[in-house]
Structures are given as structure tokens and as C-alpha cells.
């Protein structure tokens, strides 16, 4: 049934009315307003922006808009004792120092409170030693170094290029390899698109540009001092030694001009293959240490950042549902930025603002959604998804009982090529149907649907005539809702044609050059891609909040479960002898998937036929749909990751940004051939198969007829 059958609706107040009210010019205006000064988490400027958004959401017509504050652990550079890296000679004299700040972009020379580049939550320290180049510092890069090249990183300072995986995973890997410091840099191979000028003449990263970012390994914990519970006024806080996810070695980011000065002197082993070479005119030697003439020189880090418990503010707006006010559809995105936030997050926040305005306009004309819509402007996302996680921890009992869906709204663009969607399989059909009704903004697709341009430019690898939809990973505010609480979640943005560079971000990501002008001049001058993203995000929220029957299709979960079972089985079958020796069978998992498929099919048939005028039956069927995602939650969580509780999906243990399917089994199988106790290792594989099979079967049973 279409949305306009919801209660208290007139033909004027349907999805079309909501979408037609969204205006590109407003998004542009909001983006400008949100990007004129920095809005770093924990600062007065970001508090003032929170109050501004609260006030404007009230004006737009929401029923209530409240600030929710928490006191969480944040990290800042020392204003009088800057962080930098030196090359020192044999006498300990500093003969080269990296820059203390990024050259400011034109027009921003006099802006105060631009935080210099730093790695948030780095401990203090001044380690010195020989340098080892570790490529992207991925798990496989350290395997190559340690196992194939016999290079020991213990006691060394490692230099790694940004990209491919979340920076926190790089730091964790370096720690495990025994490094005593980490230098992160942006190589032009990953952050400079050929044929495009650097900012301010284009959207590429200049040599003095640096990517900021946190280097935590929180695994979904939220505030490092209050894992599992809100950082409120009466919170019990752990000591810093017991804090979750903090790095133990100093870390600092630099740009490629400074990196060149370090890398051009590298000696030792040659790079193992061309995949270890970037685009700088340096040998990309691995080390350890510098070559011939420079062999007595060392690298020294000077890190003086401090961790401080600081107040943060979420803005929570409510539009009460007319029929099911106790069912929540949430649209949330963060407000805090590293500097100006031209893309991250304000291109998303501007879209949320316009969506709120459009919903508010309808509400002022007498309309209400069927279900309650919650709008959130999260704080401290950049410091580890802290605002969203603390709020969800505080409201977990409500959310687990009432949460229908969460739609994330960080950066609206990371390119201007095509749509990118990551979501639960429950939302596949919603996304397909919605994009078929929206106009494509792409050149060459005038008069065609968004679905058509998206499918053409980003085809599904499995199903012809359908677009690619990816798994949810993490690195954004949906994490607590999906991975911890099991609330159906999705995200959408416009992306680049750069599939190989999926997790590196756009060139100016987290740099001072992420300005309003970057978006207005180079990415989306007409704000047509922003408008399309607003229509997708807003359209999903509208349907989720207004459809009489929730727009979830459980059959799509059945399809992916079979695909994921096949995939994990094929990984295990790389060890046929051990599977035989240790009697490892996937029969229980495949059986559970088969049962899920059959039960989901029958449920879908009943969903077509039931009496929708019976509010009790309607509510019952909707609850089965709502609680299906919840059924994949294991209350015990994944091994050593208690806040990642979803059995089907978790952030990859090797890359927080990427989603892994059947993560418990995957991690148990990972590098199993190197385990010292194979019997124990294969025993854990069997246990994880058991957990997965049980969970899939249990989830299937939630879709069975209730009596």
C-alpha cells in the first residue's frame, strides 16, 4: 500500500508533497551557514551550532527539540606545545621538522580555532628510531613484512599511507608488530586524482594538506571511559589505563610534501612489489632506516596531545506519530567537524535540515506521520561515534522495543558519479522502489529514473538489471543502532567512480580544505546531487514512518544469508584436510538458511493476504518485521567485541569501515593455518558455526505463525 493511505492524510500530503517541498537552494544556503567556522566537538562553536539547530527545528514545526548532553573523553593538541616529527642527526639536532599546520585556504587566513592536524587520542611521547615503511599498514602488509621479508618492526617508528582501511586498524596492527610510533600520510596515489588540480584550483589534495582523524579501536564501545552505559552526570568512569580502545604508541599524520622528505631517504629493503609503491618520486624502500649518506639520521616524534573529559551535545527532534507514536523511525547525522566540514558532515547536516523543514511544513498543514520520526544531530562522531552511542546507551530499552529503522545522514557526497547505498537486506526493496520513482540528476540520464542511472553506473555483481547495494560496516553513527541494538539501518550518498579506492575517502577528507567552496565550485554547483540524496534519505524515512505495512522484505535476507553461507563455506573449504580431521560441518548453517528461506516465503505470502483493517493483526505483522533485525542479535556479542552483537554482519576486524558477513566464523577461520593450536582453532570454528546456525534458525522462527 502507498503512503497516502496513512491516517489523517489528504491527497496533498503524500510522499510527492514531501519530496516536492525539498529545495536544492535551501540545502545550499544551509551548507553555507554550517561551514563558515570550525565546529570541533567539545568547543563553544559547536555548542552554539547545536542551539541554533534546536531553535530552527522548533521553528520548522517539530513537536519538541531537546539537547542531550554527555561528558565524554575527547582529545586535543596542546596549544602551546605543538605536535611534529623531526629528522635528527647523530648529535640529536633536528635537521628537518614537519609542518605545524596546513596552509589555510584562500579566504580563511584569519579564521581562528583551526585545529592543527593530529591523530585524536594519540598518547604523548617523543620516540625516536629508524623508520620502516609499511604500505597501508593492513594485516596483509604486516604479514608480507614479517613473514616474507623477515623485517622486524619492533622498536621502530613505522610510516604508513592512509587508505584502504580505517586508520585505527593501522595503528592496532603497528602496535601488535611492536612499533613504538606511527606516522600516517596521504600518498597522491590514493588522494590525488590524475588530471585534476589541487585545491583551491580543483578538488585534489595539495602537498600541505593533512587528514585528521581518531585512531581508536573502540569496537562499538562509545565513550572510552563508560563502555555500555551513558556518560551522564552520575557515571562511574574507568581510569585512563582501563579505558577502551586507546592507542598505546604516539601517532601523527602528515601531508605528502613532508612525507616525501622522510621517504626519499629510506634505505634497507626494496618494496616487495609495485603495490607497495605510491606516486611520489621516492623509492618506497621499506627500511629499516635511511640509506647510505643518511644512515646515522633517525626520526623523532614529538606528541603532546591531551585526553580530556568534555561536554558534548546531541540535538534530538521529535515529530510524533499519529497512529503508532511508540514506533520510532530515526534520521540521524553528525554535526561536529574536524575543521569546516564542507563535506563531512555538513553536506549531510544541510540535507537533514531541509528534510526537517519539509516534514515541518507538512505538519503545519495538519499532517502527521503514522509513526514517530526522531531527528538527531549527533556530536563527537569524529571522536569515535560518541554522541550517537551515548544517546543509544541512555535510551537502549526504548530503542530495542520501539526502534523501527535508523537512516544515517553523514556526508551527502563523496563524489558526483552515482548513488551509493549500504543497508540491511530488509531495505533493498524499499530502496529499489523509491529510486524508481525519483529522477536521476546525472548528465545523460535526463528524464530517466535514479534507479536506471544507478544500475547502469554501479551494477550489482550478482543480479543483472539491479544496482549494487553494499553491506553496512562501521565508521559512522548507524553503528550502535545496527551492530549493537539490531535496528534495521541504511545509508545513502552520492559517490565517485572509484571502486578500487572505496575506503580511502575523497582527496580532501578531514583536511582544512573541506570548505563550502569545495562543494559549490567543484562537486555540486547546482546542489542537484545533494537534492537527490535528500530525496533518497527523506523518502526512505517517509515510507518507513508512513507505510501501513513496514516496507521490509524478509525474503531478501534469505537470499543474502544463502550467499554468505556459500562464501564462508568456500573459505573453510580451503582447508579440506582439517575440516575432515576436526569434523567441521556447515550442515546446520545451511539447514537453518533453508528453513529461514521457507519461513520467510510463507510470511511474505501471509503479508499479502492479511486483513490490514485489523489493527491488532497489522501491528503483529509489523512487529514481526520490526523485530526480525533484532533477532540476529546475540546478547553475548562477538568474541572480544561485546558491543558488536549482530551475528550476520559486523565491522571487519581488519577494517572498521568494511562490513563482514558471518563475522564470528570469518574471524575464527582467518589465518587459521598459522595458529599454534589447530585443534583449539578448529574447535572455535565449529562453535561459531553453531552460534550462526542457531541464530539464523531462531530468527526464522520469529517469522513463523505466532500460534
Amino acid at each position: 500500500k502507498s503512503s497516502n493511505e496513512a491516517t489523517n492524510i489528504t491527497p496533498k500530503h503524500n510522499m510527492k508533497a514531501f519530496l516536492d517541498e525539498l529545495k536544492a537552494e535551501n540545502i545550499k544556503k544551509f551548507l553555507y551557514n554550517f561551514t563558515q567556522i570550525p565546529h570541533l566537538a567539545g568547543t563553544e562553536q559547536n555548542f552554539q551550532l547545536a542551539k541554533q539547530i534546536q531553535s530552527q527545528w522548533k521553528e520548522f514545526g517539530l513537536d519538541s527539540v531537546e539537547l542531550a548532553h554527555y561528558d565524554v573523553l575527547l582529545s586535543y593538541p596542546n596549544k602551546t606545545h605543538p605536535n611534529y616529527i623531526s629528522i635528527i642527526n647523530e648529535d640529536g639536532n633536528e635537521i628537518f621538522n614537519t609542518s605545524l599546520f596546513e596552509p589555510p585556504p584562500p579566504g580563511y587566513e584569519n579564521v581562528s580555532d583551526i585545529v592543527p592536524p593530529f591523530s585524536a587520542f594519540s598518547p604523548q611521547g617523543m620516540p625516536e628510531g629508524d623508520l620502516v615503511y609499511v604500505n597501508y599498514a593492513r594485516t596483509e602488509d604486516f604479514f608480507k613484512l614479517e613473514r616474507d621479508m623477515k623485517i622486524n618492526c619492533s622498536g621502530k617508528i613505522v610510516i604508513a599511507r592512509y587508505g584502504k582501511v580505517f586508520r585505527g586498524n593501522k595503528v592496532k596492527n603497528a602496535q601488535l608488530a611492536g612499533a613504538k610510533g606511527v606516522i600516517l600520510y596521504s600518498d597522491p596515489a590514493d588522494y590525488f586524482a590524475p588530471g585534476v588540480k589541487s585545491y583551491p584550483d580543483g578538488w585534489n589534495l595539495p602537498g600541505g594538506g593533512v587528514q585528521r582523524g581518531n585512531i581508536l579501536n573502540l569496537n562499538g564501545a562509545g565513550d572510552p571511559l563508560t563502555p555500555g552505559y551513558p556518560a551522564n552526570e552520575y557515571a562511574y568512569r574507568r581510569g585512563i589505563a582501563e579505558a577502551v580502545g586507546l592507542p598505546s604508541i604516539p601517532v601523527h599524520p602528515i601531508g605528502y610534501y613532508d612525507a616525501q622528505k622522510l621517504l626519499e631517504k629510506m634505505g634497507g629493503s626494496a618494496p616487495p612489489d609495485s603495490s607497495w609503491r605510491g606516486s611520489l618520486k621516492v623509492p618506497y624502500n621499506v627500511g629499516p632506516g635511511f640509506t647510505g649518506n643518511f644512515s646515522t639520521q633517525k626520526v623523532k616524534m614529538h606528541i603532546h596531545s591531551t585526553n580530556e573529559v568534555t561536554r558534548i551535545y546531541n540535538v534530538i527532534g521529535t515529530l510524533r506519530g499519529a497512529v503508532e507514536p511508540d514506533r520510532y523511525v530515526i534520521l540521524g547525522g553528525h554535526r561536529d567537524s574536524w575543521v569546516f566540514g564542507g563535506i563531512d558532515p555538513q553536506s549531510g547536516a544541510a540535507v537533514v535540515h531541509e528534510i526537517v523543514r519539509s516534514f515541518g511544513t507538512l505538519k503545519k498543514e495538519g499532517w502527521r506521520p503514522r509513526r514517530t520520526i526522531l531527528f538527531a544531530s549527533w556530536d563527537a562522531e569524529e571522536f569515535g561515534l560518541l554522541g550517537s552511542t551515548e544517546w543509544a546507551e541512555e535510551n537502549s530499552r526504548l530503542l530495542q522495543e520501539r526502534g523501527v529503522a535508523y537512516i544515517n545522514a553523514d556526508s551527502s557526497i563523496e563524489g558526483n558519479y552515482t548513488l551509493r547505498v549500504d543497508c540491511t537486506p530488509l531495505m533493498y526493496s524499499l530502496v529499489h522502489n523509491l529510486t524508481k520513482e525519483l529522477k536521476s540528476p546525472d548528465e545523460g540520464f535526463e528524464g530517466k529514473s535514479l534507479y536506471e542511472s544507478w544500475t547502469k553506473k554501479s551494477p550489482s555483481p550478482e543480479f543483472s538489471g539491479m544496482p549494487r547495494i553494499s553491506k553496512l560496516g562501521s565508521g559512522n553513527d548507524f553503528e550502535v543502532f545496527f551492530q549493537r541494538l539490531g535496528i534495521a539501518s541504511g545509508r545513502a550518498r552520492y559517490t565517485k567512480n572509484w571502486e578500487t579506492n572505496k575506503f580511502s575517502g575523497y582527496p580532501l577528507y578531514h583536511s582544512v580544505y573541506e570548505t563550502y567552496e569545495l562543494v559549490e565550485k567543484f562537486y555540486d554547483p547546482m546542489f542537484k546531487y545533494h537534492l537527490t540524496v535528500a530525496q533518497v534519505r527523506g523518502g526512505m524515512v517517509f515510507e518507513l514512518a508512513n507505510s501501513i505495512v513496514l516496507p521490509f522484505d524478509c525474503r531478501d535476507y534469505a537470499v543474502v544469508l544463502r550467499k554468505y553461507a556459500d562464501k564462508i563455506y568456500s573459505i573453510s573449504m580451503k582447508h579440506p584436510q582439517e575440516m575432515k580431521t576436526y569434523s567441521v560441518s556447515f550442515d546446520s548453517l545451511f539447514s537453518a538458511v533453508k528453513n529461514f528461506t521457507e519461513i520467510a516465503s510463507k510470511f511474505s505470502e501471509r503479508l499479502q493476504d492479511f486483513d490490514k483493517s485489523n489493527p491488532i493483526v497489522l501491528r503483529m505483522m509489523n512487529d514481526q518485521l520490526m523485530f526480525l533485525e533484532r533477532a540476529f542479535i546475540d546478547p553475548l556479542g562477538l568474541p572480544d567485541r561485546p558491543f558488536y552483537r549482530h551475528v550476520i554482519y559486523a565491522p571487519s576486524s581488519h577494517n572498521k569501515y568494511a562490513g563482514e558477513s558471518f563475522p564470528g566464523i570469518y574471524d575464527a577461520l582467518f589465518d587459521i593455518e598459522s595458529k599454534v593450536d589447530p585443534s583449539k582453532a578448529w574447535g572455535e570454528v565449529k562453535r561459531q558455526i553453531y552460534v550462526a546456525a542457531f541464530t539464523v534458525q531462531a530468527a526464522a522462527e520469529t517469522l513463523s505463525e505466532v500460534a
Epitope: N97, S99, F192, G207, G208, Y257, K281
Partner: antibody, heavy 120, light 111 residues
Framework: SVQLQQPGAALVRPGASVRLSCKAS????????MNWVMQRPGQGLEWIGM????????RLSQKFRDKATLTVDKSSSTVYMQLNSPTSDDSAVYYC?????????????WGQGTSVTVSS | DVVLTQAPLSLPVSLGDQASISCRSS???????????LHWYLQKPGQSPELLIY???NRFSGVPDRFSGSGSGTDFTLKIHRVEAEDLGVYFC????????FGGGTKLEIK
């Protein structure tokens, strides 16, 4: 805009060392190598050497090891080249030129050149 | 040092003609990262040299698209499609893969 300012001419006596200057503006001075290039009258271009303002690291062509000394003054964004024991053979136009770093690794901006005449 | 040999030494052309200049290197100019640091400069009469083409085929900003570079390894070519009066001067190839060197120059003049 990037500018490299050099004095137009210098007259020097044989054997009396001369210091040529090159004042940079319009960019982040410490990020880029500064090169010196010689051009004898009616001849081609010859690379002398380069200096990095951040740490004064110097690389000189083998041919000019004893002839040229490169220094930098970060406070004034100026690079200097001293010509030691000049002879008439050193009469030439001397250009400073910025190495454009990535993605160019070429001499993207040049000074106007200083014409050095070695004569008694 | 790497020797760059340019041909011809002098190239008389009529305005509107295509001009082609060759630059041959005594050793490969491909760097270990896969890039080739061979560049072209133009020195107009009485002026400093100016960068035209970097890394074999990329036009520097403001350089008209009638200039194009090509080649690999040890053999490189600069082409000027439809020569204009302002293109006259001496063209130098140069490499920065190894210790920097310049070619001897090719003088483009009116026929």
C-alpha cells in the same frame, strides 16, 4: 601568484666570489626544492644544483661541487648561490627555478635570471 | 649523467604548420614508481624558460592544447599542432628521473 625575484645583473672580478639571491613569494616556501640553472650566452641550460628550504639539504651536480654553494634564509624566503673563484668561463645567466614537487617534479616557475659577467 | 639528444637543432616552420621535436635519452627515464620524469620547456627570445609539458604528456596550466607530448623509455616527442608566432623560441627537453639534465635545445623559427 608564485614569483621568484632575482637581481638583473652582477659584475664580478675573477677570483672574487659572488652571492646571487632569489627571493620567493606566493607559495609555501619550505615545501619546495629551489634549483639553480646556468645558461652561457647562446648556449643551452645546465643544472647546477638544488636546496630544500625546510632543512637546507643540498644536492649539487658533480661538475659544480667546488664552484657553487647553496644556502637559504627561511625568514626572508630567500635562496642564495655563491659562486666560488669565478673565472670568465662562469659568465652566464643564472636562473633560480622552483621544483614543482608532486605531480610535476619539473621546474614549474623560473626567476628572470641574473646575468653574471666575470671581468677584470 | 644522462645525456639527452634533441633533433633537429633548428626547425624552420611556416605558421599553421605542425612541428615535431625529438628527444632521445642515453638511458631509460622510467622511475621505479612507473612514472617517467621527462619534461619540455620553451625559452622565448630574451626570456626565462617556461614549463610546457611535465611527465611526458601532461600540459602545465595555461599551456594551449596544440602542444602535446608523447613517448616512453628513451624516446620522446613534442608536437605543436598549427604553430603560432608566439611559439617561436628554443625548446628544451629535460629529465628529473636521475640527476637533472637538459637536452641541447631545438630552435623553432619561421621558414
Amino acid at each position: 601568484s608564485v614569483q621568484l625575484q632575482q637581481p638583473g645583473a652582477a659584475l664580478v672580478r675573477p677570483g672574487a666570489s659572488v652571492r646571487l639571491s632569489c627571493k620567493a613569494s606566493g607559495y609555501s616556501f619550505t615545501y619546495y626544492w629551489m634549483n639553480w640553472v646556468m645558461q652561457r650566452p647562446g648556449q643551452g641550460l645546465e643544472w647546477i644544483g638544488m636546496i630544500h628550504p625546510s632543512d637546507s639539504e643540498t644536492r649539487l651536480s658533480q661538475k659544480f661541487r667546488d664552484k657553487a654553494t647553496l644556502t637559504v634564509d627561511k625568514s626572508s624566503s630567500t635562496v642564495y648561490m655563491q659562486l666560488n673563484s669565478p673565472t670568465s668561463d662562469d659568465s652566464a645567466v643564472y636562473y633560480c627555478a622552483r621544483d614543482g614537487n608532486f605531480p610535476y617534479y619539473a621546474l614549474d616557475y623560473w626567476g628572470q635570471g641574473t646575468s653574471v659577467t666575470v671581468s677584470s | 649523467d644522462v645525456v639527452l639528444t634533441q633533433a633537429p637543432l633548428s626547425l624552420p616552420v611556416s605558421l599553421g604548420d605542425q612541428a615535431s621535436i625529438s628527444c632521445r635519452s642515453s638511458q631509460s627515464l622510467e622511475y621505479s614508481n612507473g612514472n617517467t620524469y621527462l619534461h619540455w620547456y620553451l625559452q622565448k627570445p630574451g626570456q626565462s624558460p617556461e614549463l610546457l609539458i611535465y611527465t611526458v604528456s601532461n600540459r602545465f596550466s595555461g599551456v594551449p592544447d596544440r602542444f602535446s607530448g608523447s613517448g616512453s623509455g628513451t624516446d620522446f616527442t613534442l608536437k605543436i599542432h598549427r604553430v603560432e608566432a608566439e611559439d617561436l623560441g628554443v625548446y628544451f627537453c629535460s629529465q628529473s628521473t636521475h640527476v637533472p639534465t637538459f637536452g641541447g635545445g631545438t630552435k623553432l623559427e619561421i621558414k
